[in-house]
């Protein structure tokens, strides 16, 4: 018979034949042959593989480094990675939670809508037209553009969400 060019789900093609993939939590020791099944071995104590695979090495569980403010939220198994979270009052810097911050700052162009608390991080909002923020801050709201008119001046340069307007003297028309 013709050697296969594609294999079923949970199989892989090697040496013109279809071998079973190793199940999650196990790594590949040796490929199948005409006469033997794929040989797999369970991952070690601090290792995991979370898919049907042909990996020869398991992945190390993530380390929740207490020096970075991390602690274990969910202990890893042979099929799942460890999930880290931050100590109480701290917030993850990313979905992967690789480090912790007290709170995040809002970038220029954004103002603070709500200051962080022990349970929620800073909430930022874009500065609307007529307002700006030129700093990175964890407490400052967007500031209103300067009103040149109230100073008897005119707008020389329009404001943006990151910059204030620039006011200048009115051109006096001579009679």
């Amino acid at each position: 018979p013709e050697p296969p060019t594609a294999c079923r789900e949970k199989q892989y093609l090697i040496n013109s034949q279809c071998c079973s993939l190793c199940q999650p939590g196990q790594k590949l020791v040796s490929d199948c042959t005409e006469f033997t099944e794929t040989e797999c071995l369970p991952c070690g104590e601090s290792e995991f593989l979370d898919t049907w695979n042909r990996e020869t090495h398991c992945h190390q569980h993530k380390y929740c480094d207490p020096n970075l403010g991390l602690r274990v939220q969910q202990k890893g198994t042979s099929e799942t990675d460890t999930i880290c979270t931050c100590e109480e009052g701290w917030h993850c810097t990313s979905e992967a939670c690789e480090s912790c911050v007290l709170h995040r700052s809002c970038s220029p162009g954004f103002g603070v809508k709500q200051i962080a608390t022990g349970v929620s991080d800073t909430i930022c909002e874009p500065c609307p037209v007529g307002f700006f923020s030129n700093v990175s801050s964890a407490f400052e709201k967007c500031h209103p553009w300067t009103s040149c008119e109230t100073k008897d001046l005119v707008v020389q340069q329009a404001g943006t969400n990151k910059t204030d307007v620039v006011c200048g003297p009115q051109d006096r028309l001579r009679a």
Epitope: C100, V101, L102
Partner: nanobody, 116 residues
Framework: EVQLLESGGGLVQPGGSLRLSCAAS????????MWWFRQAPGKGLERVSA????????YYADSVKGRFTISRDDTKNTLYLQMNSLRAEDTAVYYC?????????WRQGTLVTVSS
């Protein structure tokens, strides 16, 4: 290496005053927003006060408004917290922090005890 060293804590009677200092080194202090936090025994972290990089804007938690004053001296790379009319509930370890407020900048803090 970024270092923030808090000092000025101690034992004070209710109604008394203290001035905390935070000496900064290892970065350009001027222009950085700075915060004071505190943690009372067995409680979570509380945001006490903040000051903008320019010193022109400040923030105070409702619990300290009108009693505490935050300031900075960029020539001395130092942040201050003047605490007046102290109450028993102000007892805590006080910490200063800088953007990006990451855990690895966290230091010892200074203990303030308000008791008669």
């Amino acid at each position: 290496e970024v270092q923030l060293l808090e000092s000025g804590g101690g034992l004070v009677q209710p109604g008394g005053s203290l001035r905390l200092s935070c000496a900064a080194s290892g970065f350009t202090f001027a222009g950085y927003e700075m915060w004071w936090f505190r943690q009372a025994p067995g409680k979570g972290l509380e945001r006490v006060s903040a000051i903008s990089g320019s010193g022109g804007s400040t923030y105070y938690a409702d619990s300290v408004k009108g009693r505490f004053t935050i300031s900075r001296d960029d020539t001395k790379n130092t942040l201050y917290l003047q605490m007046n009319s102290l109450r028993a509930e102000d007892t805590a370890v006080y910490y200063c922090a800088k953007d990006p407020y990451s855990f690895d900048y966290w230091r010892q803090g200074t203990l303030v005890t308000v008791s008669s």
